[in-house]
Interface confidence: low
């Protein structure tokens, strides 16, 4: 199937599971590639981006960070090193998850006579709201 880059939702509900979308399509679908991703996070009210995970060779490596331990689930491409969907779930969202996320996509493209490295960063700002506010907003 075709790859379409879709922006992530930006409003997460406290206590619920939230999917942060990161889709990075290859420019030419027929080109073979290997891709890995690193996600970084800057919590609302802080200055520093901190790496929270790396996904490479079908292995999810979580950094030590109590805000995310046991809460991050890979929801991107599976069964391939040629990742185009690099999305994650955060389960049981708390207010500590409000802030700026960066999905860093590192791709090695294999051409007939050479290899080419590319990188792109997808930026996602997430606000965590309580369920009552979310319900009121939908009225």
């Amino acid at each position: 199937g075709g790859c379409v880059e879709v922006d992530s939702e930006t409003e997460a509900v406290y206590g619920m599971t939230f999917k942060i979308l990161c889709i990075s399509c290859k420019r030419r679908s027929e080109t073979n590639a290997e891709t890995f991703t690193e996600w970084t996070f800057r919590q609302k009210g802080t200055e520093e981006f901190v790496k929270i995970l790396r996904y490479e060779n079908e292995v999810l490596q979580l950094e030590e960070d109590e805000r995310f331990e046991g809460r991050v689930v890979w929801n991107g491409s599976r069964g391939t090193k040629d990742l185009q969907d690099l999305s994650i779930f955060i389960t049981n969202v708390t207010y500590n998850h409000s802030g700026d996320y960066e999905c860093h996509v590192y791709r090695l493209l294999f051409f007939e006579n050479y290899e080419h490295n590319t990188s792109v960063v997808k930026k996602i700002h997430i606000e965590v709201v309580d369920k009552a506010n979310r319900d009121m907003a939908s009225i």
């Epitope: 520093e48 901190v50 790496k51 979580l62 950094e63 030590e64 960070d65 109590e66 331990e69």
Partner: nanobody, 126 residues
Framework: EVQLVESGGGLVQAGSSLSLSCAAS????????MGWFRQAPGKEREFVAR????????YYTDSVKGRFTISRDRAKDTVYLQMNSLKPEDTAIYLC???????????????????WGQGTLVTVSS
């Protein structure tokens, strides 16, 4: 205030195993990420291993990966360092340390740890 007490050190032969324990009085260890460091005679104190509050995430220095295992028992409020295939270069005073921060940056740095034990001596003879 947290007082940390290490135990389990001793003199062993190269290739053997030893298990170190770190217990606390004052405040529960479960509220801290815990690290083990070591200091050999005449050398800088160096990071060995770290375990997060929940016990889900661990870090090791390259020289002990595959030989040492850090773990924690929340019920006993104790942190352990299981050391296998010991080498003479593992000889040092081993100290446990408690870190209240949840930010993972610089987990191996001494100055980010809030409380330290006095240490237990591990001597590995060849």
């Amino acid at each position: 205030e947290v007082q940390l007490v290490e135990s389990g050190g001793g003199l062993v032969q190269a290739g053997s195993s030893l298990s170190l324990s770190c217990a606390a009085s004052g405040r529960a260890l479960s509220t801290y990420a815990m690290g083990w460091f070591r200091q050999a005679p005449g050398k800088e104190r160096e990071f060995v291993a770290r375990i997060s509050r929940s016990g889900i995430t661990t870090y090791y220095t390259d020289s002990v990966k595959g030989r040492f295992t850090i773990s924690r028992d929340r019920a006993k409020d104790t942190v352990y360092l299981q050391m296998n295939s010991l080498k003479p270069e593992d000889t040092a005073i081993y100290l446990c340390a408690a870190d209240a921060s949840t930010n993972p940056a610089g987990y191996y740095l001494r100055n980010r740890y809030d409380y330290w034990g006095q240490g237990t001596l591990v001597t590995v003879s060849s």
